[in-house]
């Protein structure tokens, strides 16, 4: 029987019985919190040969090996990952081996083991037989192998039963438990499985098989199964599904999705029925079964229950990712944050469609609305009191509502209303109202001229630059020495400049009131003698790449409440010159015949420039006598990374300081310090495992079902 | 081969309450939805309402929404219909049916709600 | 609700014709419309699904077309075993609806 879509075995050891009739979990298996330690040796599920998904493990009591569990389990075929791993043991308090000793592959992504501080048997484990790769494999902060004193099966009595590979440089016994080898096929059958008598498979076949050769006889296929064949691609009118087998266009069209809440069902595209369109395409039409390719961002269409959404931080914005039109009213509150525009844009900056209102208030954080990026329509379905669709009040760091010249905004119906926004100015509202086509709608007190804009520069003189020099890491810019009525209102400039690798940067973007912003400033002291122009040398600048630069003149904002002018200059875009590439990555060499040799590379990660050829330069060497010394006949593998030594809930293990030679005199001497690389290597360790325990715990704790 | 067998069908006073089970074999059970749908002695077909078996999300026809009930049990593989405050007009043979088309349907159980 | 009218409510056809049931919705449901069979005392069997596709084990005979809010059945030689109601229904929006039927008898 095939189970799924995922398994969740929680809380209550007795929900394993749902296992009882499974060959297949087509999906994920859980196994977790569960606290009181049971006696599990009841539990026994042979018939279970197959994960299409991923195994998590945690936080099982009593449970001290999984083989009793799964005897056959053989393929993991990591279809979907946990945070890429395929299989997941973590905190399994009383696990003392893992003992899935049927388990032969397993297809994508990596393992990780941390924290079990009990568990033995991992170091006799040979991963790269099971896996492709296990350099990403993590294993850490388990039992130390010191005090496991493993031991395979038949090693007592000098009899041993299992087979030797080299990990690490150690030629040894693999097993998963005091009694149970781990499988290895002959050499003659290659990448193929083998039989429980070493007779090989079919190529067809994963994992293992009941009879050589016979791709009706595998235990899982390397492929696609269908009508209890392995095949290597789905027959005509059938269709890839869940990564492992072929179902026809009926199942597709009746199945459901795992998290679904209505029958919007599976599509079929591209030879496979999948629960979505791809990225990039949309169903063609509700409910259908194809996909179509989307004309820009593909709409999504996000509702919000109680018909207004609020947006008070980046959590609430979070819900709308992706989101294209929304159905419904926002209300943006954001009085504080870190990052908030640059956070906002990426939660928001798809929305096109607001099928209510638009009602910013209270947001001290936001210098400007530019994180609605693609915000082309408001529709009015829903207005505030006063038939408002658009309404602005007490934002008091709001300086820009969208850079207009690169906008199109249309408001279908309602009127605009702003208020208390003090660095706003008027002439920025009147702009909207022509864009919006909202223009007459207003009435005289919607858009108050007192205190809008009341603590700006809002008449702002264009500041223009005299000179740009360049060179690869330098940029010297000079401007028109700015002269308002009264000298003494001008205090200083401010440049601002950041990468802009296109020409479509605004002086908004990524700031907020907060103290984030995307362009880099520097203030500039007015020039002593009156007749030298401004300037600035920048520096410490990429060479080969395009910069956006502005001055802002600083001037006193009020004087006897008049407005007073201001002044800035428009974005110049100015390039760096080009500098030496840094050196091309990844150089391959390989020989394909005794007199000539194919190198490859990739292109350096800093050009610097234009590449325009590359200059390749050999020279004939000695041979090393190192290569006669090694025996190439010794099944070497990519060592896994250590094991710790002890469990990681200890940031530091203090150990005797190693006696050994340091700097240029013999003699015992204290462990070298850590380098810089070292610290920053633990740190980065430290910082990715709480990262992956964060995503667990928001992974698995939910709330109860009401 | 796919099977479902409602049950729990039978004569229930007006005001009554009944449960119908559906029981469902033969396939993945928490892969397909499991929809109910009615019908009234020789008159035609009404939708009922579907629920999910593998999250226990439902959708109802506003029509049954306050009185009928829909739940899944994911280690029996069955689907049960709670009617209550019946009434003479939910007589009818009630059927389960498999699938976002509807591709595998029940035989069917009598519920009569007569006095 | 989206009304789904089916006509004929019934009609007299011989063995070897060619039958056509049409069903109109009240508005646009795409292609999501399914065609049912039911014979007296059993429970309806699925035709044909997004419109156009025919169930498996359904014979060729039987074939759907349509999108929007007209959609056919059409059975283009009638047998013994045809004889039965027929109903069209879209799934296109809650609550789902299914037409009134229409009824196959031998003339």
């Known amino acids: 029987e095939i189970c799924g879509p995922g398994i969740d075995i929680r809380n209550d050891y007795q929900q394993l019985k749902r296992l009882e009739n499974c060959t297949v979990i087509e999906g994920y298996l859980h196994i977790l919190l569960i606290s009181k330690a049971e006696d599990y040796r009841s539990y026994r599920f042979p018939k279970l040969t197959v994960i299409t998904e991923y195994l998590l493990l945690f936080r099982v009591a009593g449970l001290e090996s999984l083989g009793d569990l799964f005897p056959n389990l053989t393929v993991i075929r990591g279809w979907k990952l946990f945070y890429n791993y395929a299989l997941v043991i973590f905190e399994m308090t009383n696990l003392k081996d893992i003992g899935l000793y049927n388990l032969r592959n397993i297809t994508r992504g990596a393992i990780r083991i941390e924290k079990n501080a009990d568990l033995c048997y991992l170091s006799t484990v040979d991963w790269s037989l099971i896996l492709d790769a296990v350099s990403n494999n993590y294993i850490v902060g388990n039992k130390p192998p010191k005090e496991c004193g493993d031991l395979c099966p038949g090693t007592m009595e000098e009899k041993p039963m299992c087979e030797k590979t080299t990990i690490n440089n150690e030629y040894n016994y693999r097993c998963w438990t005091t009694n149970r080898c781990q499988k290895m096929c002959p050499s003659t059958c290659g990448k193929r499985a083998c039989t429980e008598n070493n007779e090989c498979c079919h190529p067809e076949c994963l994992g293992s098989c009941s009879a050589p050769d016979n791709d009706t006889a595998c235990v899982a296929c390397r492929h696609y199964y269908y009508a209890g064949v392995c095949v290597p691609a789905c027959p005509p009118n059938t269709y890839r599904f869940e990564g492992w087998r072929c179902v026809d266009r009926d199942f597709c069209a009746n199945i459901l999705s795992a998290e679904s809440s209505d029958s919007e069902g599976f599509v079929i595209h591209d030879g496979e029925c999948m629960q979505e369109c791809p990225s990039g395409f949309i169903r063609n039409g509700s409910q259908s079964m194809y996909c179509i390719p989307c004309e820009g961002p593909c709409p999504k269409v996000c509702e919000e229950e109680k018909k207004t959404k609020t947006i008070d931080s980046v959590t609430s914005a979070q819900m709308l990712q992706g989101c294209t039109i929304f159905k419904g009213n926002l209300l943006i509150n954001i009085r504080r944050g870190n990052n908030i525009a640059s956070e906002l844009e990426n939660f928001m900056g798809l929305i096109e469609v607001v099928t209510g209102y638009v009602k910013i208030r209270h947001s001290h954080a936001l210098v400007s609305l530019s994180f609605l990026k693609n915000l082309r329509l408001i529709l009015g379905e829903e207005q505030l009191e006063g038939n408002y669709s658009f309404y602005v009040l007490d934002n008091q760091n709001l300086q820009q509502l969208w850079d207009w010249d690169h906008r199109n905004l249309t408001i279908k119906a309602g009127k605009m209303y702003f208020a208390f926004n003090p660095k706003l100015c008027v002439s920025e509202i009147y702009r909207m109202e022509e864009v919006t086509g909202t223009k007459g709608r207003q009435s005289k007190g919607d858009i108050n001229t007192r205190n809008n804009g009341e603590r700006a520069s809002c008449e702002s003189d264009v500041l223009h630059f005299t000179s740009t020099t360049t060179s690869k890491n330098r940029i010297i810019i000079t401007w028109h020495r700015y002269r308002p009525p009264d000298y003494r209102d001008l205090i200083s400039f401010t440049v601002y400049y950041k990468e802009a690798p296109f020409k479509n940067v605004t002086e908004y973007d990524g700031q907020d009131a907060c103290g984030s912003n995307s362009w880099n400033m520097v203030d500039v002291d007015l020039p002593p003698n009156k007749d030298v122009e401004p300037g600035i040398l920048l520096h410490g600048l990429k060479p080969w790449t395009q910069y956006a630069v502005y001055v802002k003149a600083v001037t006193l904002t009020m004087v006897e409440n008049d407005h007073i002018r201001g002044a800035k200059s428009e974005i110049l875009y100015i390039r760096t010159n080009a500098s030496v590439p840094s050196i091309p990555l990844d150089v391959l060499s390989a020989s394909n015949s005794s007199s000539q040799l194919i190198v490859k590379w990739n292109p350096p990660s800093l050009p610097n420039g234009n590449l325009s050829y590359y200059i390749v330069r050999w020279q004939r060497q000695p041979q090393d006598g190192y290569l006669y010394r090694h025996n190439y006949c010794s099944k070497d593998k990519i060592p896994i990374r250590k094991y710790a030594d002890g469990t990681i809930d200890i940031e530091e293990v203090t150990e005797n300081p190693k006696t050994e030679v340091c700097g240029g005199e013999k003699g015992p001497c204290c462990a070298c310090p850590k380098t810089e690389a070292e610290k920053q290597a633990e740190k980065e360790e430290a910082e990715y495992r709480k990262v992956f325990e964060n995503f667990l715990h928001n992974s698995i704790f939910v709330p109860r079902p009401e | 081969e796919v099977q479902l067998v409602e049950s729990g069908g039978g004569l229930v006073q007006p005001g009554g309450s009944l449960r119908l089970s559906c029981a469902a074999s033969g396939y993945t059970f928490t892969r397909f939805w499991i929809h109910w749908v009615r019908q009234a002695p020789g008159k035609g077909l009404e939708w009922v309402g579907e629920i999910n078996p593998s999250n226990g999300r439902t959708n109802y026809n506003e029509n049954f929404k306050n009185r009928f009930t829909i739940s899944a049990d994911t280690s029996k593989n069955t689907a049960y219909l709670q009617m209550n405050s019946l009434r003479a007009e939910d007589t009818a043979v009630y059927y389960c049916a498999r699938g976002g088309r509807l591709d595998q349907w029940g035989q069917g159980t009598l519920v009569t709600v007569s006095s | 609700d989206i009304q789904m009218t089916q006509s004929p409510s019934s009609l007299s056809a011989s063995v070897g014709d060619r039958v056509t049931i049409t069903c109109k919705a009240s508005?646009?449901?795409?292609?999501?419309v399914a065609w049912y069979q039911q014979k007296p005392g059993k429970a309806p069997k699925l035709l044909i699904y997004?419109?156009?596709y025919r169930y498996s084990g359904v014979p060729s005979r039987f074939s759907g077309s349509g999108s929007g809010t007209d959609f056919t059945l059409t059975i283009s030689s009638l047998q013994p075993e045809d004889f039965a109601t027929y109903y069209c229904h879209q799934y296109n929006n809650y609550p789902y609806t299914f037409g009134q039927g229409t009824k196959v008898e031998i003339k």
């Open positions: 997004s419109a156009s």
């Open positions: 508005q646009n449901v795409g292609s999501n």
